[in-house]
């Protein structure tokens, strides 16, 4: 399908935006309010969205002050950007079992940005490992 | 597609005022961050005034030349940006364009409306 | 405020050859390896459209004869073969912070 793998590449480029805009967050932590975030770690499988738009929902915040403002209000603003939907993603919003995103661990903004990047990668990496095994799931 | 019209142009006198507005359509507009730019006649373009989207708490902010006496707001469930304008001057003649901020760039623009100031 | 310098402020450019349009800001608008600076075209009688964002990113749907490029305060805007309808108004712009400036705009003519 021409379609279908054009939508997986949008996918793919739209996860490294992702991870160089988290990058670029992570240079304005002190520009950040020090407010503690459910970042998810050790996501399980097939609970990679539901982390995804846990850290997508979080309400992470530019502390409002200097020369920096619009730059990280932008880059936050990109961050909950929808990225185009997978097979996987459309079978994992159906799933119910798991973690609410209130029960996972609260961590500051530069942990909270590290375990975003960290999630962003294993998603990357499922994609990349599951179209080189010829499907078309994730 | 995306569009954007601006209406409440006119003739005014030094002094008076004007609400301008901003009709929006074909994209997500309670999301977006929406800018007024302003152009006067044979000259350059000038940003006036943002509000930011409803995820932001709607927060505002404007030029030095338009402060105290311009304010900007939106009604996201109208889909429509406003741009309220007292104690005009006549340096504040110009076409005003409603813009859309979309990360990085006003991407799209209406084509703007008439706001001239004389006596 | 962050004050860009446009030059030439005017052109005049036979079909078919190239183009180069400068733009100075008086203070850095680039960190951390972006550049907050973009270039729009104003068309006679038209609103502005956006040619190149972020410094060098062509805007979906602008022909690839617009680059750009630069860091830092110098930032150039290039037209590699110029075409009849890409006479107008260039106008640089930065979003570094705020307020939000542009630059006087540079007047591109046809010979």
């Known amino acids: 399908h021409k379609s279908s793998s054009q939508g997986q590449d949008r996918h793919m480029i739209r996860m490294r935006q992702l991870i160089d805009i988290v990058d670029q967050l992570k240079n304005y932590v002190n520009d950040l309010v020090p407010e503690f975030l459910p970042a998810p770690e050790d996501v399980e499988t097939n609970c990679e969205w539901s982390a995804f738009s846990c850290f997508q929902k979080a309400q992470l915040k530019s502390a409002n002050t200097g020369n920096n403002e619009r730059i990280i209000n932008v880059s936050i603003k990109k961050l909950k950007r929808k990225p185009p939907s997978t097979n996987a993603g459309r079978r994992q919003k159906h799933r119910l079992t798991c973690p609410s995103c209130d029960s996972y661990e609260k961590k500051p903004p530069k942990e909270f940005l590290e375990r975003f990047k960290s999630l962003l990668q294993k998603m990357i990496h499922q994609h990349l490992s599951s179209r080189t095994h010829g499907s078309e799931d994730s | 597609e995306v569009q954007l019209v601006e209406s409440g142009g006119g003739l005014v006198q030094p002094g008076g005022s004007l609400r301008l507005s901003c009709a929006a359509s074909g994209f997500t507009f309670s999301d977006a961050w929406m800018d007024w730019v302003r152009q006067a006649p044979g000259k350059g373009l000038e940003w006036v005034a943002e509000i930011r989207s409803e995820a932001d708490n709607h927060p505002t902010y404007y030029a030095e030349s338009v402060k105290g006496r311009f304010t900007i707001s939106r009604d996201d469930s109208k889909n429509s940006l406003y741009l309220q304008m007292n104690s005009l001057k006549t340096e504040d003649t110009a076409v005003y364009y409603c813009?859309?901020?979309?990360?990085?760039?006003?991407?799209?623009w209406g084509q703007g409306t008439l706001v001239t100031v004389s006596s | 405020d962050i004050v860009m310098t446009q030059t030439p402020l005017s052109l005049s450019v036979t079909p078919g050859q190239p183009a180069s349009i400068s733009c100075r800001a008086s203070?850095?608008?680039?960190?951390?390896?972006?550049?907050?600076m973009h270039w729009y075209l104003q068309k006679p009688g038209q609103p502005p459209q956006l040619l190149i964002y972020?410094?060098?990113n062509l805007e979906s749907g602008v022909p690839d004869r617009f680059s750009g490029s630069g860091s830092g305060t110098d930032f150039t805007l290039k037209i590699s073969r110029v075409e009849a309808e890409d006479v107008g108004v260039y106008y640089c712009?930065?979003?570094?912070?705020?307020?939000?400036?542009f630059g006087q705009g540079t007047k591109l003519e046809i010979k």
């Open positions: 972020l410094a060098s």
């Open positions: 813009t859309e901020y979309d990360y990085e760039g006003f991407v799209h």
């Open positions: 203070k850095s608008v680039s960190t951390y390896g972006y550049s907050y």
């Open positions: 712009q930065h979003s570094r912070e705020l307020p939000l400036t």
